[in-house]
């Protein structure tokens, strides 16, 4: 043999129980001692720091703090020098020392010693992650090294986590004993912080300890606050709230379109809108995420406003007869009321649509003119204004005439035309054409689609001559001889050479 | 040089206590253990025990276990063997020898007591 | 404890002989973990203190003559002195320091 201690690095009991240090020595066999003697110290393994003496096999003489709480269960010339100690306090927690004493100058501490850790509470093992769905084990530990006082364990608040399984008592690697009793469960989101107990009691004592742990089970989000569709109005300041329950806290992520808006490790974020427009309209989606798991949720926000502007498209310029297509549209919301009038005539309307579709088949000139295309909500009214423009030949209409007064005649053209017609007056008694680009004597005024052309003769009176108005543009020509109002002297004037 | 001188001769009555002293000069007091022998009268040697004179931790034969107590004054170097309630048979002489020690952190080797004092007799008579 | 006999318990050598003494062990003396004897020879003469010879079994104390040689080991010792003088003449013991300390009963030696 040689010179060597073994007992448990650390060992624990219950205040107030008592606790037996397992306890081997060894020596060189040649020293073979008489007597074998030994001495327990606490805390420190020095002599000279003269430390309270446990026990001391050759005398009774112990530390007062050991007076009647200790004893050595060991039998010392066999080598074991197993230790009780009665009555534990907490102030006996602490490092426990072993010297040989062989006699001679045969004394040897040993440096192998045991930390004595004096405990008031059982000890409740729960695995490190404990995840919701999946299932647990959670152990009751206590010490289990008094051989006159055995725990008896039972679980406390574990009502509907099953039934315990009690182990019984376990030997740990170093020779200390341990009471176990498991229990096993499935653990739900709802179990997350409950306080499980373990009380450890001994039979005819009044000696009871307790324990708690506060469970800490990890559950994918959910998310469970989260706004219904919203609406606002343009320019107003809009709150959209997520909330999410999980354990840990999950990163909340507002996006739009897969872009982030907003993310942070929280159980809620809000994503604040300042003076909303109508491009912030559409699908917001809240992303809850942790470790365990996901979860998303839409909310659609609805921006109001008032109608813009209509845009209007189409043939704007159209020839008599055709049919004409005009797109007037807008973009609102609501939808809007969309009105096409001319000359405060409606001529088509639609309830709740964004364009309005004006088909005029067959236009003739009376459909010429500005026509107001107008888009209405309860936000606002918008309107545009349109000018359709009819082409057509000329019409020679009938108030064209030639009357005389005193010594002029004035002949009236009036053609009603579009595009603007050329006109030229013919007297063709005298094989004359007079056109318009002749200011001396035509004078022409326009008046919306109508032209006049005044043709003015003087001279001295005769019969009146007959005058042939022709109009014509791209579309044709129409001629018209206009008829005499009027005394019948005509006043005449030499044209040409 | 080493020198161990011990107080002089003494008689007691019996049931009366002694006390012999061991004055050490010479060496370093407390790295060497002191250790008490026994010689009755034409008698050979007993080993009483000895004291580390560095953790002042005395260690008895087990013959010697009771009245016989062994202490130190390391301020002069000085060691005591005191023997109470004295019975005839303590009639010898007492020596004090040194050993050297040699020490491992918290413990030790002790080695052949080297140097002897010269001796004090203890008479038990009525 | 170990249990030291001597023998014989005395003699007697003329001068400049040689003497030896025996001394015997109830058990070994041997300590393995240093492969070292715990024996030692003292010499006493009358009304003197015990004087160191021999320790290790075999190694001479600083200032002892060199006709003073200890052997042995394990159970079985012996002192031998030789060229024996007058001054030489005592009570020699052997003494185990490896557990409780002990000493032999003692041989006397004497001038024949």
């Known amino acids: 043999g040689h010179w060597g201690a073994w007992m448990p690095s650390s060992i624990s009991a219950f205040e107030g129980t008592c606790v037996s240090i397992p306890c081997r020595f060894d020596f060189p066999d040649e020293l073979r001692p008489a007597v074998v003697h030994g001495v327990w110290y606490f805390n420190s393994p020095y002599p000279k720091n003269y430390p309270p003496v446990v026990f001391k096999s050759r005398t009774q003489v112990v530390h007062e703090s050991f007076q009647g709480r200790s004893r050595l269960l060991g039998d010392l010339g066999l080598r074991n020098c197993t230790l009780l100690l009665s009555n534990v306090s907490p102030e006996l927690g602490g490092k426990y020392y072993f010297r040989g004493d062989l006699g001679g100058y045969n004394q040897y501490t040993f440096s192998e010693h045991s930390v004595l850790d004096i405990v008031n509470t059982p000890n409740i093992v729960v695995p490190p992650e404990v995840v919701a769905g999946t299932e647990v084990e959670v152990s009751c530990m206590v010490p289990d090294n008094c051989p006159e006082l055995r725990p008896e364990l039972s679980w406390l608040g574990h009502e509907g986590l099953g039934e315990p399984a009690v182990l019984g008592r376990l030997r740990e690697d170093e020779g200390t004993w341990v009471q176990v009793s498991l229990l096993h469960f499935v653990p739900t989101r709802e179990a997350n912080g409950h306080r499980l107990g373990c009380q450890a009691s001994f039979p005819n004592t009044t000696l009871q300890f307790e324990g708690y742990a506060s469970m800490d089970v990890k559950y994918p989000p959910v998310i469970v606050e989260m706004n219904s569709s919203v609406e606002a109005i343009e320019g107003s300041h809009v709150s959209l709230l997520c909330g999410a329950d999980s354990n840990p806290p999950p990163l909340l992520t507002w996006m739009r379109d897969g872009t982030v808006l907003r993310e942070a490790v929280a159980e809620s974020l809000l994503l604040e809108l300042e003076e909303v427009t109508p491009a912030e309209d559409g699908v917001y989606a809240c992303l809850a995420e942790n470790a365990y798991g996901q979860d998303n949720r839409t909310v659609g926000l609805s921006v109001m406003y008032a109608p813009w502007k209509p845009t209007v498209n189409g043939t704007m310029v159209a020839v008599e007869g055709e049919t004409v297509s005009i797109l007037c549209s807008t973009q609102s919301n609501p939808d809007p009321i969309l009105t096409i009038f001319k000359e405060k005539q409606i001529l088509s309307t639609v309830i709740y649509e964004s364009e309005l579709q004006l088909e005029l088949p067959a236009v003739s000139p009376e459909d010429d003119g500005e026509y107001w295309c107008v888009a209405e909500n309860q936000y606002g009214q918008r309107a545009t204004a349109f000018n359709l423009s009819v082409e057509f030949a000329p019409v020679l209409l009938l108030e064209s005439h030639c009357a005389a007064a005193r010594d002029t005649v004035q002949c009236l053209c009036v053609v009603k035309s579009n595009p603007e017609p050329s006109v030229a007056f013919e007297l063709p008694s005298r094989n004359v054409t007079v056109n318009e680009s002749e200011r001396e004597f035509v004078y022409s005024e326009r008046s919306g689609l109508v032209l006049t052309s005044i043709l003015t003769l003087r001279g001295q009176a005769q019969a009146p001559p007959r005058v042939i108005c022709t109009a014509r543009n791209l579309y044709g020509a129409k001629s018209l001889e206009l008829p005499f109002q009027g005394a019948h002297r005509l006043m005449w004037a030499k044209i040409g050479p | 040089q080493v020198q161990l001188v011990q107080s002089g001769s003494e008689l007691k009555k019996p049931g009366a206590s002694v006390k012999v002293s061991c004055k050490a000069s010479g060496y370093t007091f407390t790295n060497y253990g002191m250790n008490w022998v026994r010689q009755a009268p034409g008698q050979g040697l007993e080993w009483m025990g000895w004291i580390n004179t560095y953790t002042g931790e005395p260690t008895y034969a087990d013959d010697f276990t009771g009245r016989f107590v062994f202490s130190l004054d390391t301020s002069v170097s000085t060691a005591y063997l005191q023997i109470s309630s004295l019975k005839a048979e303590d009639t010898a002489v007492y020596f004090c020898?040194?050993?050297?020690?040699?020490?491992?952190?918290?413990?030790?080797?002790?080695?052949?007591?080297?140097?002897w004092g010269q001796g004090t007799l203890v008479t038990v008579s009525s | 404890d170990i249990v030291m006999t001597q023998s014989p318990d005395s003699l007697a050598v003329s001068l400049g002989e040689r003497a030896t003494i025996n001394c015997k062990s109830s058990h070994s003396v041997l300590y393995s973990s240093n492969q070292k004897n715990y024996l030692a020879w003292y010499q006493q003469k009358p009304g003197q203190p015990p004087k160191l010879l021999i320790y290790?079994?075999?190694t001479r104390e600083s200032g002892v003559p060199d006709r003073f040689s200890g052997s042995g080991s394990g159970t079985d010792f012996t002192l031998t002195i030789i060229n024996l003088q007058a001054e030489d003449v005592a009570v020699y013991y052997c003494h185990q320091y490896l557990s409780s300390l002990t000493f032999g009963q003692g041989t006397k030696l004497e001038i024949k």
């Open positions: 020898a040194r050993n050297p020690i040699n020490y491992y952190g918290i413990n030790y080797e002790g080695y052949v007591m080297d140097y």
């Open positions: 290790w079994a075999s």
